[in-house]
């Protein structure tokens, strides 16, 4: 038959960041091809990454359609060499995905902080608002624009002399802080979106910058 | 086509509730948000409220307490109700599309607007 | 309480010539740029000409820009029309959640 001989795929799994989505499965193909299916829950399913001898298929520009949406995808398993054939009655093995809502469920990407300006015994920090692949009205979005304030931003920051840390908050993407005059400071930021309950709430830490350095302004 | 409706507005009496209901089509609640605002004849405009597409509401200072928006009935509509309503409400009321589905202001489908005129 | 302050009315505007309308906030805008504006015209809805201070609306002639930063923002018309003569508001989000505000609007008259 067309289908003997050919392997389900298995450990089907989500790979996403900042919206950038890409769905990952095993085994590695042995004379064996594979097709993915992304669907709505209530959707019609669409035909990704055609007779791949990959095993992973960005599916990006479908769920970017609309974040908010549950996704499923499935994994159809074909011989090598398979041609699609009308009269073809006998469906591929296949496997499902596990459900994937990118809103709630995409990973934070490393966040960078873009700037910091000091004016006497204030700086004013400014994280980077990174650009997703979220579009509407055939713009692009960034990850403030797609979140709205759902998105905080945790900034860690401690004199360079010293190890103890401070923290501030904020739903923008700026942070004004006091800081003792004639001291240096070294800054860290973490997006958050504190409404998540599971272990994509954070982002990882953005590299440290400190005071002194290129990055930052000093005004008195 | 993407597009929202008001529902009839008409005359009320002062005391009276009032419910409009914007009907939407062409998107999903789910990704945008809606907004409600008013304007009295010859004035300007008059943020109420906000609905975004988690479901959450967002309300003006003044308008806190006696107005309610919600989105429980349809999938497709939104609902505003005033209580206890007065001569100071008579306007046209609007509901618009929030751009980015949260309270960001950026509001980009407008109904046509629907007249409510309070009296005794 | 928060207020978005613009130009006062009436505007007057030459056709072909260059008009600008001033909004002030009283305190800066969500994220310094989540600033809106749009246009009104007598019996009409609000149209929507430019977000995010400067972002230009779907289908809006390029003659509108917006600008600003924080607390100042500007709408510029240039080569003004006949049809340009309306009623332009600013609206803003605030980082509390709560709060968006409209301006007073500025009547834009056209000769």
């Known amino acids: 038959s067309g289908t003997t001989n050919t392997v389900a795929a298995y450990n089907l799994t989500w790979k996403s960041t900042n919206f950038k989505t890409i769905l990952e499965w095993e085994p590695k193909p042995i004379n064996q091809v594979y097709t993915v299916q992304i669907s709505t829950k209530s959707g019609d399913w669409k035909s990704k990454c055609f007779y791949t001898a990959d095993t992973e298929c960005d599916l990006t520009d479908e769920i970017v359609k609309d974040v908010k949406q549950t996704y499923l995808a499935r994994v159809f398993s074909y011989p090598a060499g398979h041609v699609e054939s009308t009269g073809s009655t006998e469906e591929p093995p296949y496997e499902n995905s596990p459900e994937f809502t990118p809103y709630l469920e995409t990973n934070l990407g490393q966040p960078t902080i873009q700037s910091f300006e000091q004016v006497g015994t204030k700086v004013n920090v400014t994280v980077q608002d990174e650009w997703t692949l979220v579009r509407r009205n055939d713009t692009f979005l960034s990850l403030r624009d797609v979140f709205g304030k759902d998105l905080i931003y945790t900034l860690y920051y401690w004199k360079s002399s010293s190890s103890g840390k401070k923290t501030a908050k904020t739903n923008t993407n700026e942070f004004l802080i006091d800081v003792d005059k004639g001291e240096n400071y070294c800054f860290s930021v973490q997006a958050v979106i504190p409404s998540r309950r599971t272990a994509n709430r954070k982002s990882t830490d953005s590299p440290v910058e400190c005071m002194g350095h290129e990055k930052g302004e000093s005004r008195e | 086509k993407q597009s929202v409706e008001e529902s009839e507005g008409g005359l009320f009496k002062p005391t009276d509730t009032l419910t409009l209901t914007c009907t939407v089509s062409g998107f999903s609640l789910s990704y945008y948000g809606v907004s409600w605002v008013r304007q009295a004849p010859g004035n300007g405009l008059e943020w109420i409220g906000t609905?975004?597409?988690?479901?959450?509401?967002y309300y003006a200072s003044w308008a806190n307490g006696r107005f309610t928006i919600s989105n429980d009935n349809a999938p497709n509509t939104v609902s505003l109700q005033v209580n206890s309503l007065a001569a100071a409400d008579t306007a046209t009321y609007f509901c618009a599309r929030d751009f980015y589905g949260w309270n960001s202001g950026a509001l980009d489908i407008w109904g046509p607007g629907t007249l409510v005129t309070v009296s005794s | 309480e928060l207020d978005l302050t613009q130009t006062a009315s009436p505007v007057s505007a030459a056709v072909g010539g260059t008009v600008t309308i001033n909004c002030q906030a009283s305190?800066?805008?969500?994220?310094?740029?989540?600033l809106s504006w749009y246009q009104q015209k007598p019996g009409q809805p609000p149209k929507l000409l430019i977000y995010k201070a400067s972002t230009l609306a779907s289908g809006v002639p390029s003659r509108f820009s917006g600008s600003g930063f924080g607390t100042e923002f500007t709408l510029t018309i240039s080569d003004v029309q006949c049809d340009d003569a309306a009623t332009y508001y600013c609206a803003a989000a605030y980082s509390d959640d709560s709060d968006t505000a409209f301006g007073g609007g500025t009547k834009v008259v056209v000769e």
């Open positions: 305190q800066s805008v969500y994220s310094n740029k989540y």
């Open positions: 609905i975004d597409s988690s479901g959450r509401t």
